[in-house]
């Protein structure tokens, strides 16, 4: 169970970081 929650924590953070970076790039181009 701890392994599952650790995986989810990493996946959530990585997904958030990706989305935030995409937004940053879009706003700098726009």
């Amino acid at each position: 169970m701890a392994m599952v929650s650790e995986f989810l924590k990493q996946a959530w953070f990585i997904e958030n970081e990706e989305q935030e970076y995409v937004q940053t790039v879009k706003s700098s181009k726009g």
Epitope: E6, F7, K9, Q10, A11, F13, I14, E17, E18, Y21, V22
Partner: antibody, heavy 116, light 111 residues
């Protein structure tokens, strides 16, 4: 302008310790995960460690686990890497980089030489 | 031995198209996005491609990335002498709870 400036490298004997610092400016440091990446002379890149924005999660490469400690002081906009029990194979240029896995900004690096 | 596998070297002449491969597994490339970095001689690495195929602002559209399953590729078209550099792929690995790099590919522009 985003800037990352590493310091603290130098020559150290095997078994010794060193603390690297990375001073960040030009962005809201406390909002970002930060990482350390190293490169041995003439070799490829090796990820060393990463820390979440608030310091709540920390990750290490197996090669440094139990010997290196990453930390950050968000009030000083500074990232640290405490390196203990240093070995010859830790000799490398150490870079700090912004983010956990899209390293969009890198410092210029600081050279750590482990030799007797 | 790197977790992600890249050819150690690649070469091409000016104007040519060159591709660099990066092979991983289900715990890294298979489940996470791939990033590519360019390292010019004597300098720090620079972000080249993120999220498998996206270019940051300032990176020429001659550089493109793609991914299929557990492998990724970097393509450079219209090769120029200033493209001579080391190229690294990277991805987060869920099994290792660590970021992993490929061993790097040294690109030589001939002639």
């Amino acid at each position: 302008e985003v800037q990352l400036l590493e310091s603290g490298g130098g020559l150290v004997q095997p078994g010794g310790s060193l603390r690297l610092s990375c001073a960040a400016s030009g962005f809201t440091f406390s909002n970002y995960a930060m990482s350390w990446v190293r490169q041995a002379p003439g070799k490829g890149l090796e990820w060393v460690s990463a820390i979440y924005p608030g310091g709540g999660s920390i990750y290490y490469a197996d090669s440094v686990k139990g010997r290196f400690t990453i930390s950050r002081d968000n009030s000083k906009n500074t990232l640290y890497l405490q390196m203990n029990s240093l070995r010859a194979e830790d000799t490398a240029v150490y870079y700090c980089a912004r983010r956990l896995q899209i390293f969009d900004y890198w410092g210029q690096g600081t050279l750590v030489t482990v030799s007797s | 031995q790197s977790v992600l596998t890249q050819p150690p070297s690649a070469s091409g002449t000016p104007g040519q198209r060159v591709t660099i491969s990066c092979t991983g597994s289900s715990s890294n490339i298979g489940s996470n996005n791939v990033t590519w970095y360019q390292q010019l001689p004597g300098t720090a690495p620079k972000l080249l491609i993120y999220s498998d195929s996206h270019r940051p602002s300032g990176v020429p559209d001659r550089f493109s990335g793609s991914k299929s399953g557990t492998s990724a590729s970097l393509a450079i078209s219209g090769l120029q002498s200033e493209d001579e550099a080391d190229y690294y792929c990277g991805s987060w690995d869920y099994s290792l709870s660590a970021y992993v790099f490929g061993g790097g590919t040294k690109l030589t522009v001939l002639g």
